[in-house]
């Protein structure tokens, strides 16, 4: 029996087609993705093949002005229109709190939304019970397929799920659900979830009875053969894991931002065992036309956005590199721009001794969500910035000891190379890392810009000195694993909305040209 699994993950509000780097579409003939184009390809496959499932592995929420304005209603509407069969909850689905998940998405979705490792307590339990399911059994061509969902157990550190949701260990939570499904006579089981490629592989290895893993969160690009665009494959598609009980389990993920449609063909034997699996992500480029009815619907919804965000704030004469490939690995000029804006927004309290009360900024690279292309006449709009900083956070002022900052910078590179979001972009700081040293001992130089001086210069960080730092509220709250900031901060004052800080700076500067200038170095 053959099953075709079509899958998306980490779409992050890219309802409209985008440029190749998933920022705003500039040249339509070279643009990719978007729900109208996705629908064309999905319908084409549905017409050609008998048993097709369309699955999403989470993080539809957050990423462009679509989410800023519509707050998840757009996700429900267009996923319903595309007739998704199931979705797993990602961490970003909680960005507007549980209410911001229940009302716009859970209550409106016509497809099951899954997560086996989220357990509700208190009054929320009854409210969410019929809306999020641990698993769903889908009926296809007189066969049944079980789908079990999972969500990163790190979600409380990455988003705003509140105190009434418990995120359990994925494997511990999945096993009893899979056991149950097999005892209920379901022998074809897909794990669909949002915990990253490493966890996807562990689930394939450790959870008895799972036949296929469809994942998300780590934006992993897998491909067999010559890749069709810029993304470099992390492995073959599907990635085959040998389970502890000796089965070959295909694991897939489809990069991010709706640029690709994952396409996996599975053949099951009568026992429900996978006997073959093959496929590849399909690049949704301009050779695939946008479906006219979905496109018309997009245009109708678009009107509200245009009013919101199309005025020019200023211009850039350089490419603003906000790609994860740069900002999660090295100094990126988008990080420099944002940090400069954060400091600029806090220029006050100067006197004879202090040129300013604060000189330092840190910014998690994972919080930078999109680049801005200068080839659109250099124009920067609120909409562009909403794609870069989609989380609606604030840039806050904290006071920290030098020793805490040192820990933060060690944490920044403790697992360097995995494209994780904790890599820090900086302002008013010069840091040098030696990655040949063991984690926790990789910061070899950390100099900070003086504030108690008339000519600002860089001095070595003093462990016992108290420093003021501007940072996202996400970091002040211990996000991305920066627990030491949350635990050790001496003062925390809430600041201004992140996009507003940057937009004000750009409007003030009129023309910007941030450079990569040696703030972060590797020895």
């Amino acid at each position: 029996w053959e099953l075709t699994i079509l899958h998306t993950n980490d779409v992050h509000s890219r309802l409209e087609q985008t440029s190749e780097d998933s920022s705003k579409c500039v040249n339509a003939s070279r643009c990719m993705g978007g729900v109208a184009r996705l629908f064309t390809k999905v319908q084409q496959i549905r017409r050609a093949e008998p048993n097709v499932l369309l699955l999403d592995a989470g993080d539809q929420y957050q990423g462009t002005i679509w989410f800023t304005v519509y707050k998840g209603a757009e996700v429900a509407h267009f996923m319903n229109a595309l007739r998704y069969d199931a979705m797993a909850l990602g961490n970003h689905e909680f960005d507007n709190g549980v209410e911001g998940l229940i009302e716009p998405l859970l209550k409106e979705a016509k497809f099951p939304i899954l997560s086996a490792n989220i357990k509700a307590k208190g009054p929320l339990a009854s409210q969410i019970s019929g809306l999020v399911h641990p698993y769903k059994i889908l009926h296809i061509d007189s066969e049944v397929v079980g789908i079990v969902g999972y969500t990163s157990k790190e979600t409380p550190f990455l988003s705003n799920p509140g105190t009434n949701l418990v995120f359990e260990d994925e494997i511990t939570a999945l096993q009893p659900e899979v056991d149950k499904l097999t005892a209920m006579g379901v022998n074809k089981i897909i794990a669909l979830g949002h915990s990253g490629f490493e966890m996807d592989k562990l689930i394939a290895q450790k959870v008895r009875g799972v036949d296929v893993v469809v994942g998300g969160h780590s934006n992993t690009f897998l491909y067999t053969g010559n890749p069709p665009s810029k993304e470099v494959p992390a492995g073959k598609y599907p990635f085959i894991v040998t389970s502890d009980d000796g089965r070959k389990v295909p694991v897939v993920q489809a990069y991010a931002f709706g640029k690709y449609l994952g396409y996996l063909k599975i053949e099951f034997d009568e026992r429900g065992n996978v006997i073959s699996s093959h496929g590849n992500p399909i690049l949704l480029n301009s050779s695939i036309p946008e479906d006219p009815s979905i496109k018309a619907d997009i245009n109708k919804w678009r009107i509200k956005l245009d009013n919101y965000s199309t005025q020019e704030l200023g211009k850039t004469i350089v490419y603003l590199d906000g790609s994860s490939q740069s900002c999660r690995f090295r100094e990126c000029n988008m990080g420099n721009l944002i940090c400069d804006a954060m400091i600029n927004n806090n220029l006050r309290h100067a006197d004879e001794m202090f040129w300013n009360h604060v000189s330092m900024c840190i910014l998690n690279g994972g919080g930078i969500r999109s680049p801005i292309d200068e080839r659109n006449n250099g124009t920067i709009t609120w909409e562009n910035l909403a794609a870069v900083l989609p989380f609606g956070g604030t840039f806050d002022l904290v006071q920290l000891k030098g020793s805490t900052l040192k820990k933060a910078f060690e944490h920044s590179v403790h697992r360097y190379g995995q494209s994780t979001g904790e890599f820090l972009q900086v302002g008013g700081i010069h840091v040098v890392y030696d990655l040949s040293r063991k984690p926790g001992d990789r910061v070899v130089k950390l100099d900070v810009l003086c504030t108690k001086c008339r000519v600002p210069s860089y001095d070595p960080l003093k462990m016992d000195e108290v420093y003021k730092v501007i940072l996202p509220n996400f970091l002040a709250n211990g996000g991305d694993g920066f627990q030491m900031i949350k635990d050790e901060l001496l003062r925390h004052d809430s600041g201004d909305q992140d996009i507003n800080v940057v937009s004000t700076y750009i409007s003030k500067m009129k023309v910007i040209y941030p450079a990569v200038e040696g703030r972060i170095k590797f020895s």
Partner: antibody, heavy 117, light 110 residues
Framework: EVQLLESGGGLVQPGGSLRLSCAAS????????YSWVRQAPGKGLEWVSA????????YYADSVKGRFTISRDNSKNTLYLQMNSLRAEDTAVYYC??????????WGRGTLVTVSS | QSVLTQPPSASGTPGQRVTISCSGS????????VNWYQQLPGTAPKLLIY???LRLSGVPDRFSGSKSGTSASLAISGLQSEDEADYYC???????????FGGGTKLTVL
């Protein structure tokens, strides 16, 4: 044609033991999970026990936990229910069933177990 | 005592529509799909409806299933004399892991 045929029922004294068998034919036995379901005379259906496809996981109703053991032998296409410490309330027709969804669901004709002194 | 509650009996005249309810809780019907079985006198149960509302092939479309929250129901329209039987709902129960059946409803066609 799918067939599930129970055997091993009969009269047994309270405290005694009995082993029920269910022979399967017409399909690949090892592909499926199985259950035992019983029905006391004039009463409703009561699920007793289940075993997963691999045999790695078993489930029991509270009323039989610790007394009954479900097992399977895939090489013989046979499902078993070992019943120990039998009580009068265990008297029932015992059905071997491939409980599930759609065409997965199949039942045997049942075998009568009577527990009486 | 079953954790799924069904009315012990139901009746109707030929051609009428009857509904049999099955009430459970979050740990069973609330989280897991429901099957409906028909048992004619002296025979083994036979599956009618599965996954809450899907009819097994060969089952007349007079039979339909639905579920809302922690309750499920079986509707039989255009009642016929051969529908006289016992009807059982069944689902998985997470609180005592395993299948669970309703107490059964005896349907009489008057």
């Amino acid at each position: 044609e799918v067939q599930l045929l129970e055997s091993g029922g009969g009269l047994v004294q309270p405290g005694g033991s009995l082993r029920l068998s269910c022979a399967a034919s017409g399909f690949t036995f090892s592909s499926y999970a199985y259950s035992w379901v019983r029905q006391a005379p004039g009463k409703g259906l009561e699920w007793v026990s289940a075993i997963s496809g691999s045999g790695g996981r078993t489930y029991y109703a509270d009323s039989v936990k610790g007394r009954f053991t479900i097992s399977r032998d895939n090489s013989k296409n046979t499902l078993y229910l070992q019943m120990n410490s039998l009580r009068a309330e265990d008297t029932a027709v015992y059905y071997c069933a491939r409980l599930g969804y759609g065409r997965v669901d199949e039942w045997g004709r049942g075998t009568l177990v009577t527990v009486s002194s | 005592q079953s954790v799924l509650t069904q009315p012990p009996s139901a009746s109707g005249t030929p051609g009428q529509r009857v509904t049999i309810s099955c009430s459970g809780s979050l740990s069973n019907i609330g989280r897991n799909p429901v099957n409906w079985y028909q048992q004619l006198p002296g025979t083994a149960p036979k599956l009618l409806i599965y996954l809450d509302n899907l009819r097994l092939s060969g089952v007349p479309d007079r039979f339909s299933g639905s579920k809302s929250g922690t309750s499920a129901s079986l509707a039989i329209s255009g009642l016929q004399s051969e529908d006289e039987a016992d009807y059982y709902c069944a689902t998985w129960d997470d609180s005592h892991p395993g299948w669970t059946f309703g107490g059964g409803t005896k349907l009489t066609v008057l």
